[in-house]
Structure formats: C-alpha cells, structure tokens
Amino acid sequence: KLLQVSTIAMQQQEKLIQQERALLNFTEWKRSCALQMKYCQAFMQNSLSSAHNSSPCPNNWIQNRESCYYVSEIWSIWHTSQENCLKEGSTLLQIESKEEMDFITGSLRKIKGSYDYWVGLSQDGHSGRWLWQDGSSPSPGLLPAERSQSANQVCGYVKSNSLLSSNCSTWKYFICEKYALRSSV
C-alpha cells in the first residue's frame, strides 16, 4: 500500500515538473512573441514616420533642385569624409554646374563662413587628370584653380568661391550629396 502511494506521489511530482516545464516554455514563448511584436511595431513605426515625414531632404540637409546637401560639423581627411557620406547613403559633393557651385558657395557663406570643405574630386596619380568619384570628368570651368605641390594623393575642396586642391590627408570639413526625394503629391 505504502509502495503504491509513493509511486502515485512520484507520478504526480513528475507530472508537476512537466507542467512547470510547459509553463516555463509558454512564458518564454510569450516573452519572445512580445519582443517580436515590439520589434515589428518599432519597425512599422519607423517606416510610417519616414513615410509621413517625406520631406525631400533629411533633417539638417539643405535642398537645391534635385539634390540634398549636408555640410559637416567635423573635420576629417578626404577618405574618411567619403566613408562618413556613405554611412548616410550619400557621396561627397559632385558639382555639375556653375549654378550648383554658386548655390554651394552662397550657402556656405551663410552657414559657416570661409572654411575648407572636401568635395568628391580627386586627381589621378598617373595621368594627373581630375575626376569625380563616379569616374566622370569635371566641366572645364570646374577644375581646381591651383595645382597642389604634393607628392601624396591630391583631392579637391571648396573654399569661398573657389575650387582648390590639397593633399588628401589634410583635415577639412566636407559636404555630402544625395538625391532629393520626389514628392508623391
């Protein structure tokens, strides 16, 4: 009789352990679901807010026609400037026309005054040709005014109304450019 009771007690204890395990699994599953829901909601929220917030340019960027520009508040060497722009889904500024150059220099005058700003222009070490980052050549009126006396790689920068050249390893502010979003209205 005693043996029978202890067997039943053991079975009950085993059942209890199984139920506790199941409850633990369920709690874990519920927590995981809640986390996933939170994650989904946050993702949806971000997507919705960026959809509602569909101004042509991100905050702190300046718009001119089809482009958005970001004027950095930090100094960096040319290569790091390039990477900083890529993080934002943009590239270093590529000046296509005199109108764009005038807009940039006018904006810089208003924002910061006469500082140096890296743009996406560099000089090929072998040929000495100036090229934009996508491999295209600048128009004749948009070539750096002075040839840098540097044995190192030479890159282009904007200062006041001019496009100039300097050793790419010097520290300057930089300007990023991306396309403005088209309004869907």
């Epitope: 994650y39 890529l86 993080k87 934002e88 889904g89 943009s90 590239t91 996508d134 991306k178």
Partner: nanobody, 115 residues
C-alpha cells in the same frame, strides 16, 4: 546583426575579368550604401568602390575605367565587375554594408591576378 555573403573571388590572368558579388541578410534593416574594400598583404585597407541605395557611385582612382559597381536593392546585393585586371589588384576583397543597424563587413574573398 547583418550577415554578408561574398562570392566570386579567385585567380585571373592580367587583363582578365572577375565579378564579385555580396548579399546582405539579417533581421529588418535597410541599406544606405554597399561597397568593397581591399587589402593587399602588407598594405593598408582601401575603399575600392561603393554604391548608395540611390545609385550614387564612388570609385577609387586606381580602378576608374576598369571596375564598375552595381546593385540590386530589392535583394540587398552588390556586384563588383573587375575588368582589365592588373597584378596590383591582387588582394583580399571585403564587402561592406552601411545600414540602419550600423556598419558591417564580410569575411573577405581572395582575388589573385597572375600569369
């Protein structure tokens, strides 16, 4: 966390071609830019090419006119088409993704240009 899967490295003759591809995967992220760095033994890592989600392109001076970069935004995949290869292009090529979750790098794929 974003995982990057590179493929297409190998051995090529000088003047030959290779295409590298890299696919980014992971939980809910969006890619701002994707690109390729390379590192030859004993040299510094350099950015070879990158493309933004809008299709804006950045190329190193040493590869302009020879390499092209393209992407398939729907699949978070980037391709590096390398033509007119030179021995000095020999390096380990690393895929890189600048995403809303941060910046991620791949394991690298070896490219050797030799006759």
């Amino acid at each position: 966390q974003v995982q990057l899967q590179e493929s297409g490295g190998g051995l090529a003759q000088p003047g030959g071609s290779l295409q590298l591809s890299c696919a980014a995967s992971g939980r809910a992220f969006s890619t701002n830019s994707m690109g390729w760095y390379r590192q030859a033994s004993g040299k510094q890592r350099e950015l070879v090419a990158a493309i933004t989600s809008q299709g804006r392109i950045t190329l190193a001076d040493s590869v302009k006119g020879r390499f092209t970069i393209s992407s398939d935004n729907t699949k978070n995949t980037v391709f590096l088409q390398m033509n007119s290869l030179k021995p000095e292009d020999t390096a380990v090529y690393y895929c890189n993704a600048w995403t809303t979750l941060g910046t991620f790098g791949g394991q690298g794929t070896q490219v050797t240009v030799s006759s």
